[in-house]
Interface confidence: low
Amino acid sequence: SLGSLAAAEPAVIAECKTRTEVFQISRNLIDRTNANFLVWPPCVEVQRCSGCCNNRNVQCRASQVQMRPVQVRKIEIVRKKPIFKKATVTLEDHLACKCETIVTPRPVT
Amino acid sequence: SLGSLAAAEPAVIAECKTRTEVFQISRNLIDRTNANFLVWPPCVEVQRCSGCCNNRNVQCRASQVQMRPVQVRKIEIVRKKPIFKKATVTLEDHLACKCETIVTPRPVT
């Protein structure tokens, strides 16, 4: 929304860099065949590239990524009783970011 | 994706708290009547509540917010020439978060 110019600080661009984001651990990451369980924790922190680049033809992208396995609890409900199991989910952390040209596919002639 | 349990650290819940997010400054925040301009910067950082709560009946919500006016550059293109103007956009920062019960509306009987 628009406001008074007087008290406004100059806006600073959100530069292209890694930031902490929240990643929801969906159940189908653990088991696609069965929906009768819960996952704990339901979400974790990951590092992801975000922000803006200097013109619209470039996009903030990860230039270096790292896979990080974490152990979660799979809580199966069997005959109304919880059974605790362990599972591993591999998260993707972005380590470095860069402003990369958006390659638009040329139309096939 | 699933991986080996051996090297996996226990997953830590992404707690309900403020995190830095990127907010895209859309042109209609500046001027709804005219599309023939650019905004600089195109995005800024804001503080927003995110993360998970302990059960599915509660949600991470802002308990305290602050409006923050920032000055942006509105670059109008007039006869193919850029004209630099200033405008103010008011951003919403979340200052504090809480896990709040999701009130599901009762079905009308």
Epitope: V12, I13, E15, C16, K17, N57, K98, T101 | -
Partner: antibody
Amino acid sequence: EVQLVESGGGLVQPGGSLRLSCAASGFTFSSYWMSWVRQAPGKGLEWVSTISDGGGTTSYADSVKGRFTISRDNSKNTLYLQMNSLRAEDTAVYSCAESGGATDYLFDYWGQGTLVTVSS
Amino acid sequence: DIQMTQSPSSLSASVGDRVTITCRASQSISSYLNWYQQKPGKAPKLLIYAASSLQSGVPSRFSGSGSGTDFTLTISSLQPEDFATYYCQQSYITPLTFGGGTKVEIK
């Protein structure tokens, strides 16, 4: 008044290293993207590298990628260029430039430059 | 990479002359073109940015035009202090590239 003063140039042998500095004053250094541009004796201008205001985004010319590193210390209002594995073709006057216009990839203000000579 | 081709590479002109320098990009750069003036032993000075916008403090005899791939710098009435080398530069995308320069000499 905007002032950019480069230092650290000199004579170095091929394969050697140098670190250039650019001391900035007269403007809010931490709010602006900064660049290095070089000019070989009697030749034209060549862009070398650019760094964002916070230092998180960097870009390099292909001719220096992997050998040169741009960095900044906003607390000291100083821009740096670490030059390794120097070659004869890197001989030039290196100038720092401030980017503060319609795009951060133009050069509003320039320093006078510092001469780097790579020779055995 | 985007190549910037300037022409002519040099020209001789007299005080009061109208001088035109052209710059061509190897692909469209919209209006992301800037012009600089450099005098011997001095740092370059920004004259025109975004193809046609006059930098603050630059005399109005300098003007720029063009978009896409073809651009022009015009000096409407050449003054003694205008004898210098002029460079175009694209700021559309990295790697940033300059034209080879146009040296304006006294006839």
